[in-house]
């Protein structure tokens, strides 16, 4: 029987900057029951807070809601573990939450086969960012990725949009149907889940691009 | 505790490429971004660029680009630079550093000497 | 990209003195989330950087209290009290507010 070995902080995400979640990786147990307590403190201030919600993220977790969210301080906070044989604690960790966001998938994900007459064809996909994404403050710069493929196939075609909400892609093959999907992820932040996914039938008159 | 290990020296030869490893340990090597940074003897220090080896992402410093290329693999937690083209102007000290989840670095490696002479 | 000016390059102390080290960047540093990426590194002859201060005024884990820092906007000051002989080396101003991310050019602090 020991005390508890060191315990990490391994993950923080945030949805949308207004509250944000961290997980930690226990370390060995000691053979014993053990306790996780997080604490924590916002630059420039010295009190240690107690994490204030164990619960919604999970095991080994705490979540920050509303009222304990801050974007213009960093927080440092470290893990202490405690069985009957003694503690030990993880390395301070600081999040600044500006660089933890991991948005919903983007919305509306629209796709359309276009047949201009005097251009090659193309399809044309189009998308929203997520709702709770606030995009007017100018901090917040969603990059995009969408992925596509034929029904059948194993490997996905990658194309990365920039931050753009709409995308031409020329190169199909014609008869088949295609799964499309987006994600998105903000300049140093995380990306999304891929969206839920759109079919589209290629027509088979549809032209290769050369 | 967090390290980040990186070779003493490297000697090359102009025209040609190197490529600098960064090897972490002590923490979870997908977490944290790794920024890579310059310094010419007894001069200042330029950021290269970052990369995020969850997921490989990258931003280079605009200067840099066609000249570092950042990549990380993931089953040794080591992080790569490779410098191509080199000439005179390439020899320096190459640090590479961690950041939390901040767009800050507190953790550094101890830097290596890269000199270009034929 | 924005250019960091510090001042004095060379600043000779007695040990036990004050020394101020001057920060200037060619435009505001204030992020558009409200932060000021300013922080302060000292590196010691041979070594690697060290982070003494993140985000203009907030000293990093285990440095001492002895070190501080101000500042807004484009103006940012490193006061060191009391300077003892572990405090030498060069001390270098960097922004992460804007990318690429830049430094200055270093204040070398030395015995007068």
């Known amino acids: 029987q020991l005390p508890p070995g060191k315990p990490e902080i391994f993950k923080c995400r945030s949805p949308n900057k207004e509250t944000f979640t961290c997980w930690w990786r226990p370390g060995t147990d000691g053979g014993l029951p053990t306790n996780y307590s997080l604490t924590y403190h916002r630059e420039g201030e010295t009190l240690m807070h107690e994490c204030p919600d164990y619960i919604t993220g999970g095991p080994n977790s705490c979540h920050f809601g509303k009222q304990y969210t801050s974007m213009w301080r960093t927080y440092i906070m470290m893990v202490n573990a405690t069985n009957q044989m003694g503690s030990s604690f993880s390395d301070e960790l600081y999040v600044d939450v500006t660089y933890i966001v991991q948005p919903d998938p983007p919305l509306e994900l629209a796709v359309e086969v276009k047949q201009p007459e005097d251009r090659k064809p193309y399809l044309w996909i189009k998308w929203s960012p997520p709702t709770l994404i606030d995009l007017k403050t100018g901090w917040f710069t969603l990059l995009y990725e969408i992925r596509l493929k034929p029904e059948k196939a194993a490997e996905w075609e990658i194309h990365f949009a920039g931050q753009q909400t709409e995308f031409k892609i020329l190169s199909l093959h014609p008869g088949q149907k295609y799964l499309v999907q987006v994600r998105c992820k903000p300049d140093h932040g995380y990306w999304s889940a891929w969206s839920p996914a759109t079919f589209i039938q290629i027509p088979s008159d549809f032209t290769m691009n050369d | 505790q967090v390290q980040l290990q990186q070779p003493g020296a490297e000697l090359v030869m102009p025209g040609t490429s190197v490529k600098l490893s960064c090897k972490a340990s002590?923490?979870?090597?997908?977490?944290?971004?790794i920024h890579w940074v310059k310094q010419r003897p007894g001069q200042g220090l330029e950021w290269i660029g970052e990369i995020d080896p969850s997921d490989s992402y990258t931003n280079y410093n605009q200067k840099f680009k066609g000249k570092a290329t950042l990549t990380v693999d993931r089953s040794s937690s080591t992080a790569y630079m490779q410098l191509s083209s080199l000439t005179s102007e390439d020899s320096a000290v190459y640090y590479c550093g961690r950041s939390f989840f901040t767009n800050w670095f507190a953790y550094w490696g101890q830097g290596t000497l890269v000199t270009v002479s034929a | 990209d924005v250019v960091m000016t510090q001042t004095p390059l060379s600043l000779p102390v007695s040990l036990g003195d004050q020394a101020s080290i001057s920060c200037r960047s060619s435009?505001?540093?204030?992020?558009?989330?409200?932060?000021?990426?300013l922080h302060w590194y000292l590196q010691k002859p041979g070594q690697s950087p060290k982070l003494l201060i993140y985000?203009?005024?907030n000293r990093f884990s285990g440095v001492p209290d002895r070190f501080s820092g101000s500042g807004s906007g484009t103006d940012f000051t490193l006061k060191i009290n009391r300077v003892e002989a572990e405090d030498l080396g060069v001390y270098f101003c960097s922004q992460s507010t804007h990318v690429p991310f830049t430094f200055g050019s270093g204040t070398k602090l030395e015995i007068k």
């Open positions: 435009q505001s540093l204030v992020h558009s989330n409200g932060n000021t990426y």
């Open positions: 002590g923490y979870t090597f997908t977490s944290y971004w």
């Open positions: 985000k203009v005024s």
